[in-house]
Interface confidence: medium
Amino acid sequence: GVFNYETETTSVIPAARLFKAFILDGDNLFPKVAPQAISSVENIEGNGGPGTIKKISFPEGFPFKYVKDRVDEVDHTNFKYNYSVIEGGPIGDTLEKISNEIKIVATPDGGSILKISNKYHTKGDHEVKAEQVKASKEMGETLLRAVESYLLAHSDAYN
């Protein structure tokens, strides 16, 4: 089956700048600003566009060693990024893949709202564990806040 979870979170960073840093340069930024969450991001194939495969490795002590993500869509105009988790981590006997959409929407106050949709494609009748969804949400929040802090501290970066 397919289980769809949607989340919103706010950021004080303008949409265009956040998209540039958090989405387009996350591979470089995440290990730098959140080494406690991501130890490395390696480009396996592709140039960052659709079809690109990335290997994200986690630090010692994490329940998973790595995941492989596939880039599905990068929309620079609407600040939208679609990718799928296709290997490693929770992918296995019960879970086929996780399709994710991140959309960054500008807010009138100059900040932005991130709209995140996660579709868990399970095998057969298996359900998604709430803890798994919560852990994924917390990881996303950790990365976002780390990038946000970096951008607030480096006003000249990603403008």
Epitope: N4, E6, T7, E8, T9, T10, E101, I113, K115
Partner: antibody, heavy 120, light 107 residues
Framework: QVQLVESGGGVVQPGRSLTVSCAAS????????MHWVRQAPGKGLEWVAI????????FYADSVKGRFAISRDNSKNTLYLQLNSLRAEDTALYYC?????????????WGQGVLVTVSS | DIQVTQSPSSLSASVGDRVTITCRAS??????LAWFRQKPGKAPRSLIY???SLQSGVPSRFSGSGSGTNFTLTIRSLLPEDFATYYC?????????FGRGTKVEVK
């Protein structure tokens, strides 16, 4: 199961204030965004306001911005809507509603509504 | 603000009919659209979210489709309890906005 019970409605004069409440049970209230949606007699649904699970963000419909205030007390599992500077066009059934999953942003489970009538 | 235009405003149908209701958003809302059914004197009930995901416990005769600006709710084979008013809601941005509703009446 999810239960939302609104209270505090009634007849109020134009220009006056009123606070309606929504008592929540059957779920972890502090995990979910909450909405107010209203429906004027014989009319369609109008989204009024949302407050995030931790009270960190509030958003309002243009028609009520600056007049209505949404708030919550997570220790009491209660959602509030303070209606100020009331107008005849605010007469409606006011529903409180819970988000579907943490912070998805749309009303999923609804109460039965509380009627607010603005009349002199 | 995003405007949501729902059509038709009302329609007449019989039990067993296939019914289609459409909503059009004034700008791209991706898949951030939900559908609700409201019976007279009752609170609305969520049917579909994310344009096409069926809410838990909702019968499979209901389906949703679309993305971007054009969306459709289809009721495959109308049952007596389906005579009600249906609303769509965009939740791509604030303020959230509902369509004006479609009343499905008995022919």
């Amino acid at each position: 199961q999810v239960q939302l019970v609104e209270s505090g409605g009634g007849v109020v004069q134009p220009g006056r204030s009123l606070t309606v409440s929504c008592a929540a049970s059957g779920f972890t209230f502090s995990d979910y965004n909450m909405h107010w949606v209203r429906q004027a007699p014989g009319k369609g649904l109008e989204w009024v306001a949302i407050i995030w699970y931790d009270g960190s963000n509030e958003f309002y419909a243009d028609s009520v911005k600056g007049r209505f205030a949404i708030s919550r007390d997570n220790s009491k599992n209660t959602l509030y809507l303070q209606l100020n500077s009331l107008r005849a066009e605010d007469t409606a059934l006011y529903y409180c509603a819970r988000d579907n999953f943490h912070t998805s942003g749309y009303p999923w489970s609804w109460g039965q509504g509380v009627l607010v009538t603005v009349s002199s | 603000d995003i405007q949501v235009t729902q059509s038709p405003s009302s329609l007449s149908a019989s039990v067993g009919d296939r019914v289609t209701i459409t909503c059009r958003a004034s700008q791209d809302i991706s898949s951030y659209l939900a559908w609700f059914r409201q019976k007279p004197g009752k609170a609305p009930r969520s049917l579909i979210y994310a344009a096409s995901s069926l809410q838990s416990g909702v019968p499979s005769r209901f389906s949703g489709s679309g993305s971007g600006t054009n969306f459709t709710l289809t009721i495959r084979s109308l049952l007596p309890e389906d005579f009600a008013t249906y609303y769509c809601l965009q939740y791509n941005s604030y303020p959230r906005t509902f369509g004006r509703g479609t009343k499905v009446e008995v022919k």
